[in-house]
Structure formats: structure tokens, C-alpha cells
């Protein structure tokens, strides 16, 4: 902690300007009024203060606002934000998207720090839900943001926000996250026509149930193999050969190259070999002709 020392004569700061970079730490502590600093925070960013000097300025604000900074100060923190701890940020009440953007800008190009994560958490909790504008902003700064959220957190995303999501934002999402996001996406895009709908929903299909995949097969979507390989295995297994053929369209030939990988491998095992043979792709491993297929789920339901 910096000692309390009197400000030397003539050094009392009347405004926040570049002359302050020549002040020693103790002089900043003694000669800069915290209230002045708070009202002129927007100037701090333009002045090349050292990290040590920024520590002093932060200390002054902490003393002035022990319960947490007001948003008028937070919005102009600039590089001083990097000095904040998650504990500091938890005291804040950030409601303006402009404030959020300003602080994310400071951290741009870096991994999401604990400070940023805390800031986002405070902001989203304050808003009550992850609305479209917020999601737009967050995914612009952190494309993987959405996939960093738990399924529980994702459940607060309203369907309208899904319009802000780009395919790359979902690259690192796991099936549990897509299970939550897919129904929201289906709702968000439900009024679009077939081909436009597919373009939008495609990235979310890792959360699609069997029925929706069967329905997609009715829309001439010609799903590519990369998308097919990301589908839930349990959703793919009940699809018939004809449905997969219709779903993939001309891309059905790509099944051969993927026949040893899930979900194609597991799907092949569920099909009658003579049905697979009709594709003319040489897919092997289906149920031999003449074998009886028992529906175990039905058997369990009856017993």
C-alpha cells in the first residue's frame, strides 16, 4: 500500500493529462483527486501510464468506490480493466452493451481471461437472458463463447438470439450443448423456406432428433457428409436406407469413405444388407438377408 504523503506544492492535478506520466507513484497517490479521476477516466487511456502508475489509479478508484464502480467509470476504464480482479468485477452492475463492448475491446485478440468471463457473467445475469445483441457482440469477440456455456446457461438463450450465431461459433460445441441449441434454432428459423432453412439450421443439426432428420429428407437438402458425420448417432440409427439416400442426395456416395466411422458404421450395422446393396456403394456389415430383426425396445416395453 502506498504511504499517505502530502502533495508537493504546485503539483496538485487540476485535470488528467500527460504531465501525470512524470509523477512518481506516491505523487499520483497524493496529488490526484479520486473524484477528478472518476470524472475524467476517458482521458486515462490516451496517456501512456506504466503498470505501476495504473495500480495507483486503480487503488484511488477502489477507495472512492468500495462497493464497486459506477457504470460511468467502468465504461471508460480502458486498459485499467486489465488490472481488475474477478472479485472487483463481481461488485459491478454493468447494463450497457456499449460498456461491455468497450471492455471487450481492451482484451481483444487474447484468450478469454477470468476477468472477461466474470464481466460477461455479470452482464448476462443483469440482463436476465442472452439476447441477440449481446450474443452478437460476444461471438464477434469470442467465436467459441457459446460453446463455453453449460447446457443450463444455454437454456436462457432466447430463440431470437440464434440469428446472431455463425457456423464457426458452434465449432467446439459438444452434443449436450447442441441438444439445447437445436430446438431454439428450429423455432427461430421455422418460417424460412426449405433451402434457406437448411442453410441456417445446418450448423445446429448435431442436436437434431431422428424425426427432424427424416423431415429434412423431404426437403431436397443434399446434406454433405461433413454435416452427416456430426449428427447424433442415436438420431441416425433409425433412418432407413431410402431416407439417408434422400437426405444426402448426390452426396450418398460419400458413405463408402466413412463406412468405418461413426455414425455411418453403427447405422450400417442396423440396416438389412439387401437394402444397403441397393445403394450400389459396396457397403458391408448389414443384417444378413433372411435374418429376423427383433425390436428390442418393443420387447422391453411389453415385459
Amino acid at each position: 500500500e502506498v504511504e499517505k504523503t502530502a502533495c508537493p506544492s504546485g503539483k496538485k492535478a487540476r485535470e488528467i493529462d500527460e504531465s501525470l506520466i512524470f509523477y512518481k507513484k506516491w505523487e499520483l497517490e497524493a496529488c490526484v483527486d479520486a473524484a477528478l479521476l472518476a470524472t475524467q477516466m476517458d482521458r486515462v487511456n490516451a496517456i501512456p501510464f506504466t503498470y505501476e502508475q495504473l495500480d495507483v489509479l486503480k487503488h484511488k478508484l477502489d477507495e472512492l468506490y468500495p462497493q464497486g464502480y459506477p457504470e460511468s467509470v467502468i465504461q471508460h476504464l480502458g486498459y485499467l480493466f486489465l488490472k481488475m480482479s474477478p472479485e472487483d468485477i463481481r461488485k459491478w452492475n454493468v447494463t450497457s452493451l456499449e460498456t461491455l463492448k468497450a471492455l471487450l475491446e481492451v482484451n481483444k485478440g487474447h484468450e478469454m481471461s477470468p476477468q472477461v468471463a466474470t464481466l460477461i457473467d455479470r452482464f448476462v445475469k443483469g440482463r436476465g437472458q442472452l439476447d441477440k445483441d449481446t450474443l452478437d457482440t460476444l461471438t464477434a469477440f469470442y467465436p467459441g463463447y457459446l460453446c463455453s456455456l453449460s447446457p443450463e446457461e444455454l437454456s436462457s438463450v432466447p430463440p431470437s438470439s440464434i440469428w446472431a450465431v455463425r457456423p464457426q461459433d458452434l465449432d467446439t460445441c459438444d452434443p449436450r450443448q447442441l441438444d439445447v441449441l437445436y430446438p431454439k434454432a428450429r423455432l427461430a428459423f421455422q418460417n424460412m423456406n426449405g433451402s434457406e432453412y437448411f442453410v441456417k439450421i445446418q450448423s445446429f443439426l448435431g442436436g437434431a432428433p431422428t424425426e427432424d432428420l427424416k423431415a429434412l429428407s423431404q426437403q431436397n437438402v443434399s446434406m454433405d457428409l461433413a454435416t452427416f458425420m456430426k449428427l447424433r448417432t442415436d438420431a441416425v440409427l433409425p433412418l432407413t436406407v431410402a431416407e439417408v439416400q434422400k437426405l444426402l442426395g448426390p452426396h450418398v456416395e460419400g458413405l463408402k469413405a466413412e463406412e468405418r466411422h461413426r455414425p455411418v458404421r453403427d447405422w450400417i450395422l442396423r440396416q438389412r444388407q439387401d437394402d444397403l446393396d441397393t445403394l450400389g456403394l459396396g457397403l458391408q456389415g448389414g443384417i444378413p438377408n433372411g435374418y429376423l430383426v427383433l425390436d428390442l425396445s418393443m420387447q422391453e416395453a411389453l415385459s
Epitope: 431436397n220 433409425p238 431410402a242 439416400q245 434422400k246
Partner: antibody, heavy 117, light 107 residues
Framework: EVQLVESGGGLVQPGGSLRLSCAAS????????MSWVRQAPGKGLEWVAT????????YYPDSVKGRFTISRDNSKNTLYLQMNSLRAEDTAVYYC??????????WGQGTLVTVSS | DIQMTQSPSSLSASVGDRVTITCRAS??????LNWYQQKPGKAPKLLIY???RLHSGVPSRFSGSGSGTDFTLTISSLQPEDFATYYC?????????FGQGTKVEIK
């Protein structure tokens, strides 16, 4: 062996309603889309409606849209067609058919619906 | 909607004859073309799907060919049980549509 048995056909006045049923057996009903296809006397085949395996999605041609409603009860392995505002041109044999991707692969024996005053 | 046009509307043939029925789609339907056989007072039965693939239990004298808009059903050697009406159906695009039928009669 796949079996589809339609019922509920009969004589109805123009503007009237009728509900057809189709009892399915020999396959896992809840795994398949199902359809209704009709055939007017001495005429060709016309697709009437299709429903997804879970009942979420339904499809109709313009000729019956808004008048006919396809539904299903997977617990009873039964398909339905509710026909309202019936017209003389709806007179036909109505077939229930299993729908696989793009193929009507198994058909029932049909039930005759006659719309006449 | 895609229109399906079959020709001829009817034909007379003898047992053992080679019979060819054509079906034309008003726009490209890839290979999503199916053929059905219907006998009087009976339900239609699937014969061929995806242009050329025989449904289970269908005799090998039936064959199909074509692509895009023009398709053919061929019966290599007509048998007594083959006298019936044949329908083509496109499964490419909703609404799914059928041809008007071709009646194969005994000469």
C-alpha cells in the same frame, strides 16, 4: 409381414365430415412416416397427406390443405385422416400407405368414401 | 407441381411379349422415380424404386431405367399375372405426384 387395414369410409353429404383410420402391424409403426393416397373411380392415384413418424410434421397437396388433417397415435399403431368440408370430387378409395423416404412401399386395401347428396 | 406423363395410356400385348412403358417428368427428378402395379379392385404394389431397384419379391423380368426426366419400365417377357395398370411416381419434390397410369391388356 407389413399389414395396413383402413376403415371409416362410407357415404357422406357434401360439406360433411368423415374420419378414416388405418391399423398398422408387422413393423415398428413409430419409426415410419405414413401417408394417405386416394383414387377416384376409374382414375389415377393422388397423394393426399403425409405425417412424420412422431407426428410433428404434416404435408398436404393444395387440393386438401385446410380441409383434411392427418394424425397418428403411435401407442395404438393407428393412422387417421380427418376429412372436413367434403366435396363431390373427394369421392375416392382412400389408401393408407407406409412412406419410406420417397417411396410408398406398402399399401392397405383401401376404404371407399362417397360424397353425394 | 411436377407433372408426370405416361405413355401409352393403354397397350395390348400377348404373353411372352416384351413390353415398354415410358414416364416423363415435367422437370428433373434425379432418379427418384418409382413404379407401381395395380390390379382391378386391389391396392397398388411397389415394383421398382429409385428408377431401377426391384422391391423385394418382384420378379426379375421387371426392370427400370432412365434419369432426369425420362424413364422406362420394361417387362422382358409378359406373364399372365402382369396384366394390370402401371403407375409411375416421382419422389423428388413435394407434392409427390403420379402418372395417369398405363393399362396393359391381353391382346
Amino acid at each position: 409381414e407389413v399389414q395396413l387395414v383402413e376403415s371409416g369410409g362410407g357415404l357422406v353429404q357434401p360439406g360433411g365430415s368423415l374420419r378414416l383410420s388405418c391399423a398398422a402391424s408387422g413393423f415398428t409403426f413409430s419409426d415410419y412416416f405414413m401417408s394417405w393416397v386416394r383414387q377416384a373411380p376409374g382414375k389415377g392415384l393422388e397423394w393426399v397427406a403425409t405425417i412424420s413418424n412422431g407426428g410433428t410434421y404434416t404435408y398436404y397437396p393444395d387440393s386438401v390443405k385446410g380441409r383434411f388433417t392427418i394424425s397418428r397415435d403411435n401407442s395404438k399403431n393407428t393412422l387417421y385422416l380427418q376429412m372436413n368440408s367434403l366435396r363431390a370430387e373427394d369421392t375416392a378409395v382412400y389408401y393408407c400407405a407406409r412412406f419410406d423416404g420417397y417411396i410408398f412401399d406398402y399399401w392397405g386395401q383401401g376404404t371407399l368414401v362417397t360424397v353425394s347428396s | 407441381d411436377i407433372q408426370m406423363t405416361q405413355s401409352p395410356s393403354s397397350l395390348s400385348a400377348s404373353v411372352g411379349d416384351r413390353v415398354t412403358i415410358t414416364c416423363r417428368a415435367s422437370q428433373d427428378i434425379s432418379n427418384y422415380l418409382n413404379w407401381y402395379q395395380q390390379k382391378p379392385g386391389k391396392a397398388p404394389k411397389l415394383l421398382i424404386y429409385y428408377t431401377s431397384r426391384l422391391h423385394s419379391g418382384v420378379p426379375s423380368r421387371f426392370s427400370g431405367s432412365g434419369s432426369g426426366t425420362d424413364f422406362t419400365l420394361t417387362i422382358s417377357s409378359l406373364q399372365p399375372e402382369d396384366f394390370a395398370t402401371y403407375y409411375c411416381q416421382q419422389g423428388n419434390t413435394l407434392p409427390y405426384t403420379f402418372g395417369q397410369g398405363t393399362k396393359v391388356e391381353i391382346k
